[in-house]
Protein backbone atom coordinates (compact mmCIF):
# COMPACT_ATOMS: atom_id res chain seq x y z
CA UNK A 1 0.00 0.00 0.00
CA UNK A 2 1.58 3.73 -1.08
CA UNK A 3 0.94 6.43 1.29
CA UNK A 4 2.56 9.49 1.37
CA UNK A 5 4.62 9.75 4.44
CA UNK A 6 5.80 13.58 5.86
CA UNK A 7 6.04 16.08 7.86
CA UNK A 8 3.55 17.92 8.87
CA UNK A 9 1.84 16.30 5.67
CA UNK A 10 3.65 19.02 3.03
CA UNK A 11 6.72 18.20 1.24
CA UNK A 12 8.11 14.85 1.01
CA UNK A 13 7.53 13.26 -2.41
CA UNK A 14 5.93 10.28 -2.55
CA UNK A 15 2.57 8.74 -3.98
CA UNK A 16 -0.30 8.32 -1.97
CA UNK A 17 -3.79 6.76 -2.61
CA UNK A 18 -7.35 7.77 -2.56
CA UNK A 19 -9.30 6.54 0.31
CA UNK A 20 -11.33 4.25 -2.22
CA UNK A 21 -9.10 3.18 -5.04
CA UNK A 22 -7.87 0.63 -3.37
CA UNK A 23 -9.52 -3.17 -2.44
CA UNK A 24 -10.45 -3.20 1.35
CA UNK A 25 -8.35 -6.62 1.28
CA UNK A 26 -4.97 -4.92 0.05
CA UNK A 27 -4.53 -3.04 3.64
CA UNK A 28 -5.35 -5.16 5.51
CA UNK A 29 -2.14 -7.50 5.91
CA UNK A 30 0.33 -5.03 7.52
CA UNK A 31 -2.28 -3.07 9.17
CA UNK A 32 -2.17 -5.74 12.35
CA UNK A 33 0.68 -3.34 12.84
CA UNK A 34 -0.52 -2.51 16.20
CA UNK A 35 1.28 -1.95 19.01
CA UNK A 36 -0.54 -3.98 21.58
CA UNK A 37 1.04 -3.94 24.86
CA UNK A 38 3.83 -6.58 25.97
CA UNK A 39 2.33 -8.98 28.71
CA UNK A 40 -0.76 -10.05 28.51
CA UNK A 41 -3.75 -9.09 31.63
CA UNK A 42 -4.20 -12.54 33.34
CA UNK A 43 -8.07 -13.59 33.90
CA UNK A 44 -7.70 -14.06 37.28
CA UNK A 45 -6.41 -10.52 37.59
CA UNK A 46 -8.81 -7.87 39.14
CA UNK A 47 -8.34 -4.95 36.73
CA UNK A 48 -8.15 -2.45 39.47
CA UNK A 49 -6.73 -4.50 42.34
CA UNK A 50 -3.76 -2.95 44.47
CA UNK A 51 -1.98 -6.61 44.78
CA UNK A 52 1.43 -8.59 43.04
CA UNK A 53 -0.09 -12.11 42.20
CA UNK A 54 2.46 -14.67 42.19
CA UNK A 55 1.24 -15.93 38.62
CA UNK A 56 0.16 -14.72 35.60
CA UNK A 57 1.14 -12.02 33.39
CA UNK A 58 4.19 -9.74 34.52
CA UNK A 59 1.94 -6.91 34.95
CA UNK A 60 0.01 -8.83 37.52
CA UNK A 61 2.95 -9.61 39.27
CA UNK A 62 4.77 -6.75 39.50
CA UNK A 63 5.18 -5.13 42.74
CA UNK A 64 4.26 -1.62 40.61
CA UNK A 65 1.21 -3.73 39.23
CA UNK A 66 -0.56 -2.05 36.30
CA UNK A 67 -3.36 -2.91 33.79
CA UNK A 68 -3.72 -1.69 30.43
CA UNK A 69 -6.12 0.89 28.71
CA UNK A 70 -7.00 0.88 24.46
CA UNK A 71 -6.86 4.05 22.73
CA UNK A 72 -8.02 3.46 19.57
CA UNK A 73 -8.05 6.09 16.90
CA UNK A 74 -9.50 5.28 13.34
CA UNK A 75 -7.05 7.82 11.55
CA UNK A 76 -3.74 6.66 13.00
CA UNK A 77 -1.97 3.92 12.60
CA UNK A 78 -1.46 2.01 14.60
CA UNK A 79 -5.16 2.36 14.89
CA UNK A 80 -4.64 0.84 18.66
CA UNK A 81 -2.28 1.88 21.16
CA UNK A 82 -2.47 0.61 24.96
CA UNK A 83 -1.65 2.81 27.94
CA UNK A 84 -0.18 1.24 30.79
CA UNK A 85 -2.18 2.51 34.07
CA UNK A 86 -0.50 2.28 37.60
CA UNK A 87 -3.29 0.41 40.40
CA UNK A 88 -0.96 1.57 43.10
CA UNK A 89 0.69 4.65 43.85
CA UNK A 90 3.37 3.21 46.14
CA UNK A 91 4.98 -0.15 45.72
CA UNK A 92 3.43 -3.30 47.44
CA UNK A 93 5.17 -5.34 49.56
CA UNK A 94 7.64 -8.17 48.23
CA UNK A 95 6.97 -9.98 51.75
CA UNK A 96 3.14 -10.04 51.57
CA UNK A 97 1.85 -8.78 47.74
CA UNK A 98 -0.48 -6.59 48.56
CA UNK A 99 0.55 -4.11 51.83
CA UNK A 100 1.91 -1.04 49.92
CA UNK A 101 5.50 0.10 51.20
CA UNK A 102 5.82 3.98 50.98
CA UNK A 103 9.42 3.68 50.38
CA UNK A 104 8.72 3.16 47.11
CA UNK A 105 6.96 5.23 44.42
CA UNK A 106 5.01 3.22 41.61
CA UNK A 107 5.67 4.84 38.21
CA UNK A 108 4.81 5.36 34.60
CA UNK A 109 7.11 4.50 32.30
CA UNK A 110 6.87 6.95 29.05
CA UNK A 111 7.76 6.69 25.98
CA UNK A 112 7.19 8.96 22.73
CA UNK A 113 6.08 6.53 20.51
CA UNK A 114 6.12 7.57 16.34
CA UNK A 115 2.58 7.50 15.14
CA UNK A 116 1.08 8.31 11.58
CA UNK A 117 -2.20 9.78 11.05
CA UNK A 118 -4.02 9.83 8.06
CA UNK A 119 -4.53 13.54 6.40
CA UNK A 120 -6.16 15.08 3.32
CA UNK A 121 -3.13 15.36 1.23
CA UNK A 122 -2.48 18.97 0.81
CA UNK A 123 -4.58 20.57 -1.99
CA UNK A 124 -6.89 17.74 -2.71
CA UNK A 125 -10.36 18.20 -2.47
CA UNK A 126 -13.89 16.14 -4.01
CA UNK A 127 -14.51 12.46 -3.19
CA UNK A 128 -11.88 10.80 -4.52
CA UNK A 129 -9.14 13.10 -2.91
CA UNK A 130 -5.60 11.01 -1.90
CA UNK A 131 -4.53 10.74 1.96
CA UNK A 132 -1.69 11.22 3.24
CA UNK A 133 0.43 10.02 6.40
CA UNK A 134 1.72 12.43 8.67
CA UNK A 135 4.00 11.54 11.19
CA UNK A 136 3.69 12.44 14.78
CA UNK A 137 5.17 11.85 18.11
CA UNK A 138 2.88 10.43 20.84
CA UNK A 139 2.70 9.91 24.56
CA UNK A 140 1.98 6.46 25.81
CA UNK A 141 3.03 4.67 29.33
CA UNK A 142 4.37 1.38 28.65
CA UNK A 143 4.46 0.31 32.11
CA UNK A 144 4.72 1.14 36.03
CA UNK A 145 8.11 0.72 37.63
CA UNK A 146 9.12 0.82 41.36
CA UNK A 147 11.50 3.28 41.80
CA UNK A 148 12.70 5.09 45.14
CA UNK A 149 11.76 8.63 45.67
CA UNK A 150 13.18 11.00 44.07
CA UNK A 151 15.56 13.21 46.38
CA UNK A 152 16.21 17.22 45.40
CA UNK A 153 19.56 18.49 46.09
CA UNK B 1 8.80 9.48 0.63
CA UNK B 2 6.83 6.61 -1.53
CA UNK B 3 7.65 2.59 -0.77
CA UNK B 4 5.66 -0.45 -1.01
CA UNK B 5 5.24 -2.24 2.47
CA UNK B 6 3.95 -5.61 2.51
CA UNK B 7 4.03 -8.99 4.33
CA UNK B 8 7.10 -10.44 3.21
CA UNK B 9 8.09 -8.44 0.21
CA UNK B 10 6.07 -9.99 -2.13
CA UNK B 11 2.16 -8.78 -2.59
CA UNK B 12 0.60 -5.85 -1.85
CA UNK B 13 -0.16 -3.54 -5.07
CA UNK B 14 1.39 -0.51 -4.02
CA UNK B 15 4.56 1.66 -5.53
CA UNK B 16 7.64 1.39 -4.37
CA UNK B 17 10.98 4.04 -5.17
CA UNK B 18 14.33 2.97 -6.70
CA UNK B 19 17.38 3.63 -3.80
CA UNK B 20 19.07 6.12 -6.51
CA UNK B 21 16.05 8.07 -7.36
CA UNK B 22 15.28 9.89 -4.27
CA UNK B 23 18.15 11.41 -1.87
CA UNK B 24 19.01 9.74 0.53
CA UNK B 25 17.91 12.54 3.10
CA UNK B 26 13.94 11.35 2.29
CA UNK B 27 14.57 8.39 3.74
CA UNK B 28 16.25 9.87 6.88
CA UNK B 29 13.24 12.29 7.63
CA UNK B 30 10.81 9.62 8.32
CA UNK B 31 13.05 6.79 9.09
CA UNK B 32 15.03 8.91 11.78
CA UNK B 33 11.39 8.45 13.66
CA UNK B 34 13.88 6.68 15.60
CA UNK B 35 12.62 5.29 19.01
CA UNK B 36 14.74 6.89 21.32
CA UNK B 37 14.94 5.46 25.26
CA UNK B 38 11.58 6.15 27.15
CA UNK B 39 14.04 7.91 29.94
CA UNK B 40 17.57 9.81 28.70
CA UNK B 41 20.42 8.45 30.43
CA UNK B 42 21.45 10.46 33.03
CA UNK B 43 25.70 11.09 32.37
CA UNK B 44 26.07 11.04 36.23
CA UNK B 45 24.15 7.43 36.13
CA UNK B 46 27.27 4.20 36.38
CA UNK B 47 25.22 2.07 33.46
CA UNK B 48 26.41 -0.98 35.09
CA UNK B 49 25.62 -0.64 38.52
CA UNK B 50 23.23 -2.70 40.46
CA UNK B 51 21.74 -0.13 42.78
CA UNK B 52 18.98 2.12 42.95
CA UNK B 53 20.07 6.05 42.82
CA UNK B 54 17.60 8.87 44.62
CA UNK B 55 18.04 11.00 41.35
CA UNK B 56 18.47 10.82 37.73
CA UNK B 57 16.12 9.03 35.26
CA UNK B 58 13.79 6.22 35.90
CA UNK B 59 15.64 3.68 34.82
CA UNK B 60 18.16 4.26 37.67
CA UNK B 61 16.07 5.15 40.32
CA UNK B 62 14.02 1.93 39.76
CA UNK B 63 14.49 -0.88 42.26
CA UNK B 64 15.06 -3.30 39.09
CA UNK B 65 17.59 -0.89 37.66
CA UNK B 66 18.67 -1.33 33.84
CA UNK B 67 20.69 0.37 31.09
CA UNK B 68 19.96 0.78 27.09
CA UNK B 69 21.97 -0.47 24.40
CA UNK B 70 21.19 0.69 21.22
CA UNK B 71 20.39 -1.25 18.27
CA UNK B 72 21.25 -0.02 14.77
CA UNK B 73 20.55 -1.24 11.23
CA UNK B 74 20.40 1.40 8.74
CA UNK B 75 17.58 -0.71 6.79
CA UNK B 76 15.60 -0.47 8.89
CA UNK B 77 12.83 1.67 9.91
CA UNK B 78 13.00 2.48 12.62
CA UNK B 79 16.91 2.78 12.28
CA UNK B 80 17.68 2.87 16.72
CA UNK B 81 16.08 0.31 18.98
CA UNK B 82 16.97 0.42 22.35
CA UNK B 83 16.81 -2.78 24.36
CA UNK B 84 16.45 -2.17 28.40
CA UNK B 85 19.67 -4.92 30.17
CA UNK B 86 18.72 -5.25 33.62
CA UNK B 87 21.28 -4.81 35.98
CA UNK B 88 20.61 -7.18 38.92
CA UNK B 89 18.65 -10.72 38.90
CA UNK B 90 16.69 -9.59 42.22
CA UNK B 91 15.14 -6.33 43.21
CA UNK B 92 17.35 -4.06 45.18
CA UNK B 93 15.83 -3.04 49.20
CA UNK B 94 14.37 0.03 48.90
CA UNK B 95 15.82 0.77 52.10
CA UNK B 96 19.23 0.52 51.26
CA UNK B 97 19.20 1.08 47.72
CA UNK B 98 21.99 -1.46 47.35
CA UNK B 99 21.36 -4.69 49.07
CA UNK B 100 19.32 -7.57 47.04
CA UNK B 101 16.18 -8.67 48.10
CA UNK B 102 15.75 -12.44 46.83
CA UNK B 103 12.08 -12.09 47.52
CA UNK B 104 11.74 -10.36 44.18
CA UNK B 105 13.19 -11.07 40.64
CA UNK B 106 14.28 -8.18 38.20
CA UNK B 107 13.02 -9.40 35.32
CA UNK B 108 12.90 -7.55 31.12
CA UNK B 109 9.56 -6.33 30.20
CA UNK B 110 9.28 -8.17 26.37
CA UNK B 111 7.41 -6.69 23.37
CA UNK B 112 6.97 -7.72 20.22
CA UNK B 113 7.85 -4.22 17.90
CA UNK B 114 6.73 -3.80 14.34
CA UNK B 115 9.46 -2.81 12.35
CA UNK B 116 10.31 -2.39 8.39
CA UNK B 117 12.98 -3.56 6.78
CA UNK B 118 13.95 -1.82 3.45
CA UNK B 119 14.20 -5.29 0.70
CA UNK B 120 14.87 -5.45 -3.28
CA UNK B 121 11.34 -5.36 -4.34
CA UNK B 122 10.68 -9.01 -5.69
CA UNK B 123 12.10 -9.21 -9.27
CA UNK B 124 13.50 -6.10 -9.30
CA UNK B 125 17.22 -6.12 -10.34
CA UNK B 126 19.69 -3.89 -12.05
CA UNK B 127 21.12 -0.63 -11.01
CA UNK B 128 17.94 1.45 -10.77
CA UNK B 129 15.78 -1.54 -8.70
CA UNK B 130 13.11 -0.48 -6.23
CA UNK B 131 13.17 -0.91 -2.77
CA UNK B 132 10.45 -2.07 -0.64
CA UNK B 133 9.21 -2.17 3.51
CA UNK B 134 9.18 -5.71 4.03
CA UNK B 135 7.00 -5.71 7.60
CA UNK B 136 8.78 -7.54 10.60
CA UNK B 137 7.92 -8.37 14.57
CA UNK B 138 11.28 -7.66 16.47
CA UNK B 139 11.36 -8.14 19.97
CA UNK B 140 12.65 -5.74 21.87
CA UNK B 141 13.00 -5.31 26.07
CA UNK B 142 11.65 -2.22 27.21
CA UNK B 143 12.57 -1.97 30.92
CA UNK B 144 13.12 -4.44 33.49
CA UNK B 145 10.63 -4.90 36.53
CA UNK B 146 10.20 -6.20 40.05
CA UNK B 147 8.37 -9.00 40.07
CA UNK B 148 7.00 -11.50 42.87
CA UNK B 149 8.73 -14.47 41.64
CA UNK B 150 6.11 -17.08 39.85
CA UNK B 151 4.75 -19.90 42.35
CA UNK B 152 3.67 -22.93 39.97
CA UNK B 153 0.45 -24.36 40.82
CA UNK C 1 -19.08 -21.71 12.60
CA UNK C 2 -18.51 -19.04 15.24
CA UNK C 3 -20.45 -19.26 18.78
CA UNK C 4 -21.00 -17.51 21.76
CA UNK C 5 -22.45 -19.25 24.37
CA UNK C 6 -23.18 -17.21 27.79
CA UNK C 7 -24.03 -18.19 30.77
CA UNK C 8 -27.75 -18.52 32.61
CA UNK C 9 -30.12 -16.08 34.31
CA UNK C 10 -28.84 -14.60 37.66
CA UNK C 11 -30.97 -13.20 40.56
CA UNK C 12 -29.13 -10.43 42.33
CA UNK C 13 -30.04 -8.25 45.49
CA UNK C 14 -28.71 -4.83 45.28
CA UNK C 15 -25.21 -3.94 46.51
CA UNK C 16 -24.33 -7.54 45.13
CA UNK C 17 -21.90 -8.55 41.74
CA UNK C 18 -22.69 -10.47 39.50
CA UNK C 19 -19.93 -12.57 37.18
CA UNK C 20 -21.09 -13.35 33.43
CA UNK C 21 -19.61 -15.63 31.02
CA UNK C 22 -18.57 -16.10 27.47
CA UNK C 23 -17.59 -19.13 25.73
CA UNK C 24 -16.37 -18.62 22.03
CA UNK C 25 -16.08 -21.27 19.35
CA UNK C 26 -15.18 -21.71 15.49
CA UNK C 27 -12.18 -18.63 15.65
CA UNK C 28 -9.07 -17.99 16.86
CA UNK C 29 -10.33 -16.37 20.33
CA UNK C 30 -6.92 -13.74 21.36
CA UNK C 31 -7.70 -12.80 17.79
CA UNK C 32 -10.26 -11.07 17.88
CA UNK C 33 -11.88 -7.83 20.87
CA UNK C 34 -14.87 -9.04 22.65
CA UNK C 35 -17.44 -5.80 23.52
CA UNK C 36 -19.97 -6.42 26.11
CA UNK C 37 -23.36 -4.81 25.39
CA UNK C 38 -26.42 -4.52 27.59
CA UNK C 39 -30.38 -3.53 26.93
CA UNK C 40 -32.63 -3.01 29.71
CA UNK C 41 -36.48 -4.39 29.35
CA UNK C 42 -38.23 -2.44 26.41
CA UNK C 43 -34.84 -0.17 25.60
CA UNK C 44 -32.25 -0.08 23.21
CA UNK C 45 -28.43 -1.08 23.52
CA UNK C 46 -25.80 0.49 25.22
CA UNK C 47 -22.42 -0.57 24.63
CA UNK C 48 -20.48 -1.59 27.91
CA UNK C 49 -16.74 -2.06 27.15
CA UNK C 50 -14.46 -4.22 25.35
CA UNK C 51 -11.42 -6.41 26.45
CA UNK C 52 -8.81 -7.65 23.85
CA UNK C 53 -8.36 -11.38 25.08
CA UNK C 54 -4.99 -11.49 23.30
CA UNK C 55 -3.26 -8.41 25.55
CA UNK C 56 -6.23 -7.78 28.09
CA UNK C 57 -6.38 -4.26 27.21
CA UNK C 58 -9.60 -2.86 27.94
CA UNK C 59 -11.87 -0.19 27.11
CA UNK C 60 -15.13 0.84 29.24
CA UNK C 61 -17.55 3.11 28.47
CA UNK C 62 -17.38 6.11 31.30
CA UNK C 63 -21.06 5.20 33.22
CA UNK C 64 -19.15 1.88 34.07
CA UNK C 65 -15.60 3.15 35.11
CA UNK C 66 -14.82 1.00 38.72
CA UNK C 67 -17.90 -0.79 38.31
CA UNK C 68 -17.02 -3.37 35.57
CA UNK C 69 -14.23 -5.97 35.07
CA UNK C 70 -13.88 -7.94 31.72
CA UNK C 71 -11.42 -10.37 32.20
CA UNK C 72 -10.33 -13.53 29.77
CA UNK C 73 -9.33 -16.54 30.16
CA UNK C 74 -7.51 -18.07 27.31
CA UNK C 75 -7.01 -21.69 27.73
CA UNK C 76 -11.38 -22.36 28.09
CA UNK C 77 -11.67 -19.25 25.24
CA UNK C 78 -13.89 -17.59 27.60
CA UNK C 79 -14.24 -14.42 28.22
CA UNK C 80 -16.05 -12.13 31.61
CA UNK C 81 -18.05 -9.55 32.36
CA UNK C 82 -18.48 -8.70 35.99
CA UNK C 83 -20.58 -5.90 37.50
CA UNK C 84 -20.67 -5.10 41.35
CA UNK C 85 -22.05 -2.53 43.22
CA UNK C 86 -25.52 -3.41 41.45
CA UNK C 87 -28.59 -1.34 41.49
CA UNK C 88 -32.13 -2.41 40.46
CA UNK C 89 -31.85 -0.22 36.93
CA UNK C 90 -28.74 -2.97 36.08
CA UNK C 91 -31.57 -5.40 35.24
CA UNK C 92 -31.26 -6.19 31.74
CA UNK C 93 -30.31 -8.35 29.26
CA UNK C 94 -26.05 -8.62 29.01
CA UNK C 95 -24.45 -9.89 25.39
CA UNK C 96 -21.24 -10.54 24.63
CA UNK C 97 -20.07 -9.88 20.74
CA UNK C 98 -17.04 -10.58 18.71
CA UNK C 99 -15.62 -7.57 16.96
CA UNK C 100 -14.86 -8.30 13.59
CA UNK C 101 -12.51 -6.00 11.76
CA UNK C 102 -12.29 -5.83 7.93
CA UNK C 103 -10.69 -3.51 5.81
CA UNK C 104 -8.92 -0.93 3.86
CA UNK C 105 -6.13 -1.28 6.41
CA UNK C 106 -3.94 -0.38 7.92
CA UNK C 107 -7.52 1.97 8.86
CA UNK C 108 -9.41 -0.94 9.84
CA UNK C 109 -13.18 -1.38 10.18
CA UNK C 110 -14.98 -2.93 13.12
CA UNK C 111 -18.04 -4.36 13.39
CA UNK C 112 -19.81 -6.84 16.26
CA UNK C 113 -20.15 -9.61 14.14
CA UNK C 114 -21.24 -12.65 15.97
CA UNK C 115 -23.23 -12.54 19.14
CA UNK C 116 -24.28 -14.37 22.29
CA UNK C 117 -27.73 -15.36 23.15
CA UNK C 118 -28.05 -13.10 25.79
CA UNK C 119 -27.91 -13.56 29.68
CA UNK C 120 -30.68 -11.94 32.19
CA UNK C 121 -29.52 -9.92 35.07
CA UNK C 122 -32.15 -9.53 37.34
CA UNK C 123 -31.38 -7.19 40.14
CA UNK C 124 -34.38 -7.08 42.96
CA UNK C 125 -34.31 -6.80 46.48
CA UNK D 1 -19.90 11.19 23.59
CA UNK D 2 -21.07 10.73 20.18
CA UNK D 3 -24.99 10.89 20.01
CA UNK D 4 -27.08 8.77 17.47
CA UNK D 5 -30.53 9.95 16.79
CA UNK D 6 -32.63 7.24 15.10
CA UNK D 7 -35.68 7.66 13.21
CA UNK D 8 -38.63 6.49 13.39
CA UNK D 9 -38.87 4.58 16.39
CA UNK D 10 -41.49 2.49 14.96
CA UNK D 11 -43.02 1.91 11.65
CA UNK D 12 -45.95 -0.52 10.41
CA UNK D 13 -45.36 -1.50 6.43
CA UNK D 14 -46.75 -4.20 3.72
CA UNK D 15 -44.78 -7.04 2.45
CA UNK D 16 -42.89 -6.16 -1.12
CA UNK D 17 -42.83 -2.51 0.33
CA UNK D 18 -39.81 -0.09 0.71
CA UNK D 19 -38.79 0.64 4.24
CA UNK D 20 -36.07 3.60 5.40
CA UNK D 21 -34.74 4.37 8.66
CA UNK D 22 -32.28 6.81 9.09
CA UNK D 23 -30.00 7.35 11.34
CA UNK D 24 -27.91 10.99 12.44
CA UNK D 25 -25.06 11.75 14.76
CA UNK D 26 -23.89 14.17 16.50
CA UNK D 27 -21.37 14.90 14.43
CA UNK D 28 -19.00 13.52 11.94
CA UNK D 29 -18.42 9.97 12.16
CA UNK D 30 -16.80 9.65 8.57
CA UNK D 31 -18.68 7.20 7.77
CA UNK D 32 -18.00 5.25 10.19
CA UNK D 33 -21.68 3.43 10.80
CA UNK D 34 -23.14 -0.11 11.51
CA UNK D 35 -26.50 -1.61 11.40
CA UNK D 36 -27.59 -4.08 13.54
CA UNK D 37 -31.27 -6.81 13.23
CA UNK D 38 -32.70 -7.87 16.45
CA UNK D 39 -35.53 -10.63 16.22
CA UNK D 40 -38.59 -10.98 18.69
CA UNK D 41 -36.82 -13.52 20.62
CA UNK D 42 -33.84 -11.51 21.59
CA UNK D 43 -31.03 -12.88 18.54
CA UNK D 44 -28.94 -9.94 17.17
CA UNK D 45 -27.15 -10.00 13.74
CA UNK D 46 -24.85 -7.67 11.92
CA UNK D 47 -26.27 -6.18 8.60
CA UNK D 48 -23.67 -3.87 6.88
CA UNK D 49 -20.81 -2.39 7.89
CA UNK D 50 -18.92 1.25 7.42
CA UNK D 51 -22.30 2.72 6.22
CA UNK D 52 -22.92 0.26 3.27
CA UNK D 53 -20.93 -2.79 3.32
CA UNK D 54 -23.05 -6.21 3.53
CA UNK D 55 -21.87 -8.43 6.38
CA UNK D 56 -21.52 -12.00 4.64
CA UNK D 57 -25.03 -13.77 3.95
CA UNK D 58 -27.03 -10.59 4.40
CA UNK D 59 -29.70 -10.71 1.59
CA UNK D 60 -29.38 -8.01 -1.05
CA UNK D 61 -32.67 -6.37 -0.26
CA UNK D 62 -30.47 -4.57 2.62
CA UNK D 63 -28.31 -1.61 1.57
CA UNK D 64 -27.14 1.52 3.46
CA UNK D 65 -25.89 4.95 2.38
CA UNK D 66 -24.95 8.49 3.83
CA UNK D 67 -22.16 10.38 4.70
CA UNK D 68 -21.36 13.10 7.61
CA UNK D 69 -23.69 12.97 10.24
CA UNK D 70 -26.63 11.39 7.98
CA UNK D 71 -27.06 7.86 7.41
CA UNK D 72 -29.80 6.08 5.87
CA UNK D 73 -30.90 1.84 6.14
CA UNK D 74 -33.06 0.40 3.14
CA UNK D 75 -34.88 -2.63 2.84
CA UNK D 76 -35.81 -2.29 -0.45
CA UNK D 77 -39.18 -5.71 -0.31
CA UNK D 78 -39.86 -6.00 2.85
CA UNK D 79 -39.73 -9.96 3.69
CA UNK D 80 -42.24 -11.70 6.54
CA UNK D 81 -39.08 -12.48 7.75
CA UNK D 82 -37.85 -9.05 8.64
CA UNK D 83 -39.88 -8.07 11.41
CA UNK D 84 -37.23 -6.81 13.44
CA UNK D 85 -36.03 -4.12 15.34
CA UNK D 86 -33.05 -2.25 14.15
CA UNK D 87 -30.07 -0.39 15.55
CA UNK D 88 -27.35 1.95 13.97
CA UNK D 89 -24.47 1.87 15.74
CA UNK D 90 -21.02 4.28 15.43
CA UNK D 91 -17.86 3.00 15.75
CA UNK D 92 -15.77 6.68 14.68
CA UNK D 93 -14.96 7.27 18.48
CA UNK D 94 -14.86 5.06 21.74
CA UNK D 95 -17.14 4.91 23.73
CA UNK D 96 -19.15 3.38 20.94
CA UNK D 97 -23.14 4.43 21.08
CA UNK D 98 -26.14 2.91 19.42
CA UNK D 99 -29.45 4.63 17.83
CA UNK D 100 -32.20 4.27 20.12
CA UNK D 101 -33.64 1.59 17.19
CA UNK D 102 -36.57 1.32 14.88
CA UNK D 103 -39.08 -1.51 15.27
CA UNK D 104 -40.46 -3.00 12.30
CA UNK D 105 -43.46 -4.24 12.03
CA UNK D 106 -45.96 -5.87 9.16
CA UNK D 107 -49.01 -4.35 8.62
Known amino acids: VSLRIQEGCSHLPSCCPSKEQEPPEEWLKWSSASVSPPEPLSHTHHAESCRASKDGPLNSRAISPWSYELDRDLNRVPQDLYHARCLCPHCVSLQTGSHMDPLGNSVPLYHNQTVFYRRPCHGEEGTHRRYCLERRLYRVSLACVCVRPRVMA | VSLRIQEGCSHLPSCCPSKEQEPPEEWLKWSSASVSPPEPLSHTHHAESCRASKDGPLNSRAISPWSYELDRDLNRVPQDLYHARCLCPHCVSLQTGSHMDPLGNSVPLYHNQTVFYRRPCHGEEGTHRRYCLERRLYRVSLACVCVRPRVMA | QVQLVQSGAEVKKPGASVKVSCKAS????????MNWVRQAPGQGLEWMGL????????SYKQKFQGRVTMTVDKSISTAYMELSRLRSDDTAVYYC??????????????????WGQGTLVTVSS | DIQMTQSPSSLSASVGDRVTITCQAS??????LNWYQQKPDGTIKLLIY???TLHTGVPSRFSGSGSGTDYTFTISSLQPEDIATYYC?????????FGQGTKLEIK
Open chain 3, 97 to 114: AREGYYGPSPFHHYAMDY
Open chain 3, 26 to 33: GYSFTGYT
Open chain 3, 51 to 58: INPDNGGT
Open chain 4, 27 to 32: QDISNY
Open chain 4, 50 to 52: YTS
Open chain 4, 89 to 97: QQYSKLPYT
